[in-house]
Interface confidence: low
């Protein structure tokens, strides 16, 4: 059959691997596009075919599986490099087919170089640790399947350029790195280097991740509205500009959505006819606590506007709060000729 269901170039999975290291890449068809796995496909008589397009070339070509020492091989639904070379960079396609069925997807593979301090163009995963929270661990990622459980690799951990030893609150424990009490000073890039033997050769796997120390849930509080508050009154004359800031502090909460909004007479500003603009700014502390400021602005306020209720609302996973701004119309200063003169009994 000429027909082949082509899922295009799957850039959602931008695969990056280090030069001169083993890499195992699973065909994305079974992980993201098809509802059956490789074993089911294989037992149904379907064949998995691999080919690739070199960087800056349009020509699809077969993958050479006859290189010395089986440098590139295929095992079930996995394409193996032992090890990678810089010019392996390109778009790889896996195609599942028989005489009546065909499905394929391409994905980009980038082989990147690293320096002696593990710096590289590699996109790094971020692992968040709670500040002063007790023992927390990070695990050397993406090393499953490279060697059998009978092989005992050696693992070395680095922070930046430095091998981790005699760090007072960070302890290497094989594949894990334990933080006894995470501190801001623990922010940084951590690298595990896994070394293992295979068929008389020694391979290295390098994995780097970024640790970010964030606010602890035990210190988290509901949103705190700093402004508006009871101490500030927004007193304006008709025609003046009314500016009311709503400033809210949010504790860091993993996966929490922080929201701030204004209501005017109980309605969202979009739902009323007055000419109001709202500008938002966001700042973060070093532990990713967040301060959001929304400034409500009415360019030329009317006496009607000054009678309205202006309420700032805030919500996070910890709760919802609201605070009304104190808005009033400024009483005009008395004009001497009439008001004061009358006050002194003049006629």
């Amino acid at each position: 059959s000429e027909r082949c269901d082509d899922w295009g170039l799957d850039t959602m999975r931008q695969i990056q691997v280090f030069e001169d290291e083993p890499a195992r890449i699973k065909c994305p068809l079974f992980e993201h596009f098809l509802k059956f796995n490789y074993s089911t496909a294989h037992s149904a008589g379907l064949t998995l075919i691999w080919y690739w397009t070199r960087q800056d070339r349009d020509l699809e070509e077969p993958i050479n599986f006859r290189l010395p020492e089986n440098r590139i091989s295929k095992e079930k639904d996995v394409l193996w490099f032992r090890p990678t070379l810089l010019n392996d960079t390109g778009n790889y396609t896996c195609m599942l087919r028989n005489t009546t069925y065909c499905s394929k997807v391409a994905f980009p593979l980038e082989v990147v170089q690293k320096d002696s301090c593990f710096n590289s163009p590699m996109k790094l995963p971020v692992h968040k640790l709670y500040i002063e929270y007790g023992i927390q661990r990070i695990t050397c990622p993406n090393v499953d399947g490279y060697f059998p459980s009978s092989v005992k690799p050696t693992i070395t951990w680095y922070m930046g350029c430095y091998k981790i030893q005699n760090f007072n609150n960070v302890i290497p424990e094989g594949m894990n790195l334990s933080f006894l009490i995470a501190l801001i000073s623990n922010n940084g890039n951590y690298t595990c280097v896994v070394t293992y033997p295979e068929n008389g050769r020694t391979f290295h796997l390098t994995r780097t991740l970024t640790v970010k120390v964030v606010g602890s849930p035990k210190n988290a509080v509901p949103p705190v509205i700093h402004s508006p508050n009871d101490h500030v009154v927004y007193e304006k004359e008709p025609g003046e500009e009314l500016l009311i800031p709503c400033t809210v502090y949010f504790s860091f909460l993993m996966d929490s959505r922080n929201e701030v909004w204004w209501t005017i007479d109980g309605k969202k500003p979009d739902d009323i006819t007055i000419d109001v603009t709202i500008n938002e700014s966001i700042s973060h502390s070093r532990t990713e606590d967040e301060t959001r400021t929304q400034i409500l602005s009415i360019k030329k306020v009317t006496s009607e506007d000054l009678k309205r209720s202006y309420v700032c609302h805030a919500r996070s996973a910890k709760g919802e709060v609201a605070k009304a701004a104190k808005v009033k119309q400024k009483v005009p200063a008395p004009r001497y000729t009439v008001e004061l003169a009358c006050g002194f009994g003049a006629t």
């Epitope: 027909r3 082949c4 269901d5 082509d6 899922w7 295009g8 170039l9 799957d10 850039t11 959602m12 068809l29 596009f33 098809l34 509802k35 059956f36 349009d58 069925y101 499905s103």
Partner: antibody, heavy 118, light 107 residues
Framework: EVQLLESGGGLVQPGGSLRLSCAAS????????MSWVRQAPGKGLEWVSA????????LYADSVKGRFTISRDNSKNTLYLQMNSLRAEDTAVYYC???????????WGQGTLVTVSS | EIVMTQSPATLSVSPGERATLSCRAS??????LAWYQQKPGQAPRLLIY???TRATGIPARFSGSGSGTEFTLTISSLQSEDFAVYYC?????????FGQGTKVEIK
């Protein structure tokens, strides 16, 4: 003659559900990947979802992921789009289109209007 | 995702004149680009696929060119039925994306 005919559109409240259908004629649906593409009033085209010719592979735009489900019944030569938790921003004309990797969206239906409003 | 940018937003042309529409991709889409024509109240119609191949039944006055990130749709001599909105679309990378459209109107 290849024809695609959408149905099932209408007015629905936010949070509600609708199921769109696309009946194919003039070709065998099972031979092609199919897609839904939408167009908000006065706006451009936005790809929504795709399904492989055997129904085993599905893809969704981030804007509808988790809310919309694409499916097909090849025996009825019909494509479906189940839309749940509808939002005002889902208001659009929804087109079904036949997709082939080398010829893109080569045939389109006439579209069905979905209006999400309270 | 790949962003497709079309220019100009509106093109005013007299019947019989040549119209040139541009489409730019934020990263290379090889030659996996299509052009569609849409008239008010109608569904889009495929004009060009593979950047330069005319779809079945499309008149020879429509031609496409380009590859990588820069693409052009040319209508050599505009007929009255050609006044419409034209969209480009890449189908190289998931998710598939469209340009915002170019309206070709009568001058």
């Amino acid at each position: 003659e290849v024809q695609l005919l959408e149905s099932g559109g209408g007015l629905v409240q936010p949070g509600g559900s609708l199921r769109l259908s696309c009946a194919a004629s003039g070709f065998t649906l099972s031979g092609f990947s199919m897609s839904w593409v939408r167009q908000a009033p006065g706006k451009g085209l936005e790809w929504v979802s795709a399904i492989s010719y055997d129904g085993e592979g599905t893809l969704y735009a981030d804007s509808v992921k988790g809310r919309f489900t694409i499916s097909r019944d090849n025996s009825k030569n019909t494509l479906y789009l189940q839309m749940n938790s509808l939002r005002a921003e889902d208001t659009a004309v929804y087109y079904c289109a036949r997709f082939r990797y080398y010829t893109a969206f080569d045939y389109w239906g006439q579209g069905t209007l979905v209006t999400v409003s309270s | 995702e790949i962003v497709m940018t079309q220019s100009p937003a509106t093109l005013s042309v007299s019947p019989g004149e040549r119209a040139t529409l541009s489409c730019r991709a934020s990263q290379s889409v090889s030659s996996n680009l299509a052009w569609y024509q849409q008239k008010p109240g109608q569904a889009p119609r495929l004009l060009i696929y593979g950047a330069s191949t005319r779809a079945t039944g499309i008149p020879a006055r429509f031609s496409g060119s380009g590859s990588g990130t820069e693409f052009t749709l040319t209508i050599s001599s505009l007929q009255s039925e050609d006044f419409a909105v034209y969209y480009c679309q890449q189908y190289n990378n998931w998710p598939w994306t469209f340009g915002q459209g170019t309206k070709v109107e009568i001058k």
